[in-house]
Interface confidence: low
């Protein structure tokens, strides 16, 4: 799934101000394609540990075996640990499942660093804090891996929620969500609210747990504020979108918009950072450096290698700029923008010797495979993956981290011409050689 294992290093913190607000209306009439309103049974069904990804509880087999599964919109295989591993507390035991069916086929998924391989089969799968359905789904039983599972992460598998085109070993292996929609009445849509722990915590592992919601089949109004704005899914492989303009503190980066999407732009819950193509990254860092020039930071900080620390509670958020990405809208010549704060792109690092300090890593990094809107972006927003209408929606998350001066935003419409020209067309011959 892209170059390098893309699991989050830290999911970040989350929250909204303590504030007196009117209750939201959560019982609206259902709207196609997905039910809207209240999904209390699915709210808060994601968990995680500091930096190690968001996972949902799933059951596989008969009788059900419970596993925690990483939610990944940047890949398309449902793959679970199926053999003992030093980092796994539990694993899928196919021999104990009366409903397991062997597909007699192997799968091998190499990354730039690390890999996993396994055996394909099908079994009955359900999500306890999800829709009340059971589906027969393809499962890659991971028998060998290298640098894939994370010590102490508490998840034992990965749920690839993208499209069949990028499934391994090939696009004939139906992804889990396709199976779910085909076999049930669940609408072809899911939405994600990735949240953090709520405080800049560093006391203990328990406090460093994160949360969030994966609403399967609909949209829950209690998870966002304001309006949802939609951008078209350019092509159904990754969740590919088109960025048409980038601003740092309202100043246009003034690059050819093709550069923003070279060679693609995707929304990926399995990546921590906002990753930008080389030229865009360099221009963005130059602009962020200039905006925050009242304090000087080492080069290693901008490369994501070094921490910067401030005395607890004194992080100068105000010196760091907001970053706005303009996305192609649903109407011709219309775009909208999503704006994130330094509270999203400065990633708190917990395990430091000086617990009196608040320390951060810069969570924007360089990419050779296009723009990746990872957790840094997603933690600011409630993100609707409306597969039925081939679009992705963004609204301000009710749990994003901010301060008393600024908040993340989703705003529009803006007039933007020739947006189609912003998409990059990957040469057909190159696609089959893309390393996951």
């Amino acid at each position: 799934t892209q170059h390098g294992i893309r699991l989050p290093l830290r999911s970040g913190l989350g929250g909204a101000p303590l504030g007196l607000r009117l209750p939201r209306e959560t019982d609206e009439e259902p709207e196609e394609p997905g039910r809207r309103g209240s999904f209390v049974e699915m709210v808060d069904n994601l968990r995680g540990k500091s930096g190690q990804g968001y996972y949902v509880e799933m059951t596989v087999g008969s009788p059900p075996q419970t596993l925690n599964i990483l939610v990944d919109t940047g890949s398309s295989n449902f793959a679970v640990g199926a053999a003992p591993h030093p980092f796994l507390h539990r694993y899928y035991q196919r021999q104990l499942s009366s409903t397991y069916r062997d597909l007699r086929k192997g799968v091998y998924v190499p990354y730039t660093q690390g890999k996993w391989e396994g055996e394909l089969g099908t079994d009955l799968v359900s999500i306890p804090h999800g829709p009340n359905v059971t589906v027969r789904a393809n499962i890659a039983a991971i028998t060998e891996s290298d640098k894939f599972f994370i010590n102490g992460s508490n998840w034992e598998g990965i749920l690839g929620l993208a499209y069949a085109e990028i499934a391994r070993p090939d696009d004939s292996l139906e992804p889990f969500f396709d199976s779910l929609v085909k076999q049930t009445h669940v609408p072809n849509l899911f939405s994600l609210q990735l949240c953090g722990a709520g405080f800049p915590l560093n006391q203990s592992e328990v406090l460093a747990s994160v949360g969030g919601s994966m609403i399967i089949g609909g949209i829950d109004h209690s998870l966002y504020t304001g309006s949802l704005w939609y951008t078209p899914i350019r092509r159904e492989w990754y969740y590919e979108v088109i960025i048409v303009r980038v601003e740092i503190n309202g100043q246009d980066l003034k690059m050819d918009c093709k550069e923003y999407n070279y060679d693609k732009s995707i929304v990926d819950s399995g990546t921590t950072n906002l990753r930008l193509p080389k030229k865009v990254f360099e221009a963005a860092v130059k602009s962020i450096k200039a905006a925050s020039s009242t304090e000087k930071f080492p080069d290693g900080f901008w490369l994501g290698e070094q921490l910067v620390c401030w005395q607890a509670g004194t992080t100068p958020w105000n010196i760091f700029p907001v970053i706005s990405l303009y996305l192609m809208g649903e109407v011709t010549n219309q775009s909208f923008r999503i704006t994130i704060l330094p509270q999203q792109y400065l990633r708190p690092v917990e395990d430091v010797a000086t617990s009196q300090d608040d320390c951060y890593k810069f969570a924007i990094s360089q990419s050779s495979t296009g723009t990746v809107m990872g957790a840094v972006i997603m933690e600011g927003f409630y993100v609707v993956f409306d597969r039925a209408r081939k679009r992705i929606g963004f609204a301000v998350s009710a749990c994003h981290v901010h301060d008393e001066f600024r908040t993340a935003a989703v705003e529009g419409p803006f007039v933007t011409l020739d947006m189609e020209d912003c998409g990059y067309n990957i040469p057909q011959t190159d696609e089959s050689t893309l390393m996951t």
Epitope: L13, R21, D44, F199, G211, S213, C399, D403
Partner: nanobody
Framework: DVQLQESGGGSVQAGGSLRLSCAVS????????MAWFRQAPGKEREGVAG????????YYADSVKGRFTISQDNAKNTVYLQMNSLAPEDTAIYYC??????????????????WGQGTQVTVSS
């Protein structure tokens, strides 16, 4: 860090009312769930009422529905628990808690990462 300080506890006759307050100080900007818990002698701590700040949604334990009301005052950074029609079984130490978790486990103790010291409520018959 976040500090929580409860007040308003005391002794009251059955059928009476009390209003508990929880003052929140410190790093308050990212709190989005507040709750009241209570612990009666010899019993486990239980969730009584919770409020989810972004939507103002309130949650109550069945045992207090219709009698207790949780509310918040942004200007004072304070969360309140108005307790009416008190009964002897409401006698307990009442704790205020804050967390970043969401709604489905709002009345569960796990995940709350800031707690007050507690305030005693005694209801006599």
């Amino acid at each position: 860090d976040v500090q929580l300080q409860e007040s308003g506890g005391g002794s009251v006759q059955a059928g009476g009312s009390l209003r508990l307050s929880c003052a929140v100080s410190g790093y308050t900007y990212n709190i989005y769930t507040m709750a009241w818990f209570r612990q009666a002698p010899g019993k486990e701590r239980e969730g009584v009422a919770g409020i989810y700040s972004p939507g103002g949604t309130t949650y109550y334990a069945d045992s207090v529905k219709g009698r207790f009301t949780i509310s918040q005052d942004n200007a004072k950074n304070t969360v309140y628990l108005q307790m009416n029609s008190l009964a002897p079984e409401d006698t307990a130490i009442y704790y205020c808690a804050a967390r970043g978790g969401l709604l489905s486990r709002v009345l569960k103790e796990a995940g709350y990462n800031a707690w007050g010291q507690g305030t005693q409520v005694t209801v006599s018959s």
